[in-house]
């Protein structure tokens, strides 16, 4: 019979054969031949091999660097890379979380929208009408102005997106 | 090795602009911030901001808010700064570092000179 | 904005004796997450700076084991056991707590 061009999912073609692949966890030892399959043997602590395949060498687990600000997320495992996120106030620069950014506060004038996360910094929204922001802060949101009507008080001085109002008696009616 | 290699000498007059640019290489790009801090002549240093190439991101220091922009492409791997209205105190050393386990590696320093 | 105060300011120190720089700061630089983010940085004469040591303690990689950093929330030393010819220049300290990011006024060391 004619030598195989193609083969199947799960196989590769060697020395004119279809030998099957690896599965993920574990690396190539040695080709199938025609009366041999393929051998292979699992990865060792600390590697991960996460597709099937014909590798030689599994890789190397990610190293979570303390000193960059990194922690382990997910341990890995022989089929999977270990998972870094950054340490608490801190976020990944990129998908790939190899350094830590510190998280940015909003200004005053500004409230946070949304907190920041492991991965994604803070988002920071300017204080509408209505509402002040006094504080640098990566948690506070823009606060409502106080109402002094509420309070049976009038305003004596208008609020802005940095300051409260401030609120005064009212000024009684002489008879 | 990771080098930053910035661009050269500017003299610049009253309210004009300068943009500096900062070639990284060495390392992945998108991996790491870089941030600017200036030095004026026999002062200190002064944290001007950064950008997260990832993300194009920045994040300025307030007191210059309003008045410089950091950009990165990814493309070239090289980030710039550029300081508008310029003022003769804005006379300095400017460096572009990149941050990883501190500011770990900065560019040689690019010498503007405010001057009418 | 947190402010770095160092001290002192001129250091003349005489090779092969100690030397110590103090740095203080305006709030305290220990984050709940247990680390204090303060960092030293020695500009050498006509250089860019360089950094030294990182969150507080641990010595960049290539610094001489002469270096050391200490302190609390607060109040943070540099020690050189034994200062050398080279160790000349300004040394920093800057806090990244949170932004902005500020340096030390700067600490000359030079060789008496």
């Known amino acids: 019979p004619e030598p195989p061009t193609a083969c199947r999912e799960k196989q590769y073609l060697i020395n004119s054969q279809c030998c099957s692949l690896c599965q993920p966890g574990q690396k190539l030892v040695s080709d199938c031949t025609e009366f041999t399959e393929t051998e292979c043997l699992p990865c060792g602590e600390s590697e991960f091999l996460d597709t099937w395949n014909r590798e030689t060498h599994c890789h190397q687990h990610k190293y979570c660097d303390p000193n960059l600000g990194l922690r382990v997320q997910q341990k890995g495992t022989s089929e999977t890379d270990t998972i870094c996120t950054c340490e608490e106030g801190w976020h990944c620069t990129s998908e790939a979380c190899e350094s830590c950014v510190l998280h940015r506060s909003c200004s005053p004038g500004f409230g946070v929208k949304q907190i920041a996360t492991g991965v994604s910094d803070t988002i920071c929204e300017p204080c509408p009408v209505g509402f002040f922001s006094n504080v640098s802060s990566a948690f506070e949101k823009c606060h409502p102005w106080t109402s002094c009507e509420t309070k049976d008080l009038v305003v004596q001085q208008a609020g802005t997106n940095k300051t409260d109002v401030v609120c005064g008696p009212q000024d009684r009616l002489r008879a | 090795e990771v080098q930053l290699v910035q661009s050269g000498a500017e003299v610049k007059k009253p309210g004009s602009s300068v943009k500096v640019s900062c070639k990284a290489s060495?390392?992945?790009?998108?991996?790491?911030?870089m941030h600017w801090v200036r030095q004026a002549p026999g002062q200190g240093l002064e944290w001007m901001g950064y950008i997260n190439p990832s993300s194009d991101y920045p994040n300025y220091n307030q007191k210059f808010k309003d008045r410089v922009t950091i950009t990165a492409d990814k493309s070239t791997s090289t980030a710039y700064m550029e300081l508008s209205s310029l003022r003769s105190e804005d006379t300095a050393v400017y460096y572009c570092?990149?941050?990883?386990?501190?500011?770990?590696?900065w560019g040689q320093g690019t010498t503007v000179t405010v001057s009418s | 904005d947190i402010v770095m105060t160092q001290s002192p300011l001129s250091l003349p120190v005489t090779p092969g004796e100690p030397a110590s720089i103090s740095c203080r700061s305006s709030k305290s630089l220990l984050h709940s997450n247990g680390n204090t983010y303060l960092y030293w940085y020695l500009q050498k004469p006509g250089q860019s700076p360089q950094y030294l040591i990182y969150?507080?303690?641990t010595l960049a990689s290539g610094v001489p084991d002469r270096f050391s950093g200490s302190g609390s929330g607060t109040d943070f030393t540099l020690k050189i056991s034994r200062v050398e010819a080279e160790d000349v220049g300004v040394y920093y300290c800057m806090q990244h707590l949170e932004y902005p990011l500020t340096f030390g006024q700067g600490t000359k060391l030079e060789i008496k």
């Open positions: 969150r507080m303690s």
């Open positions: 060495g390392y992945t790009f998108t991996s790491y911030t």
């Open positions: 570092a990149r941050w990883g386990y501190s500011f770990d590696y």
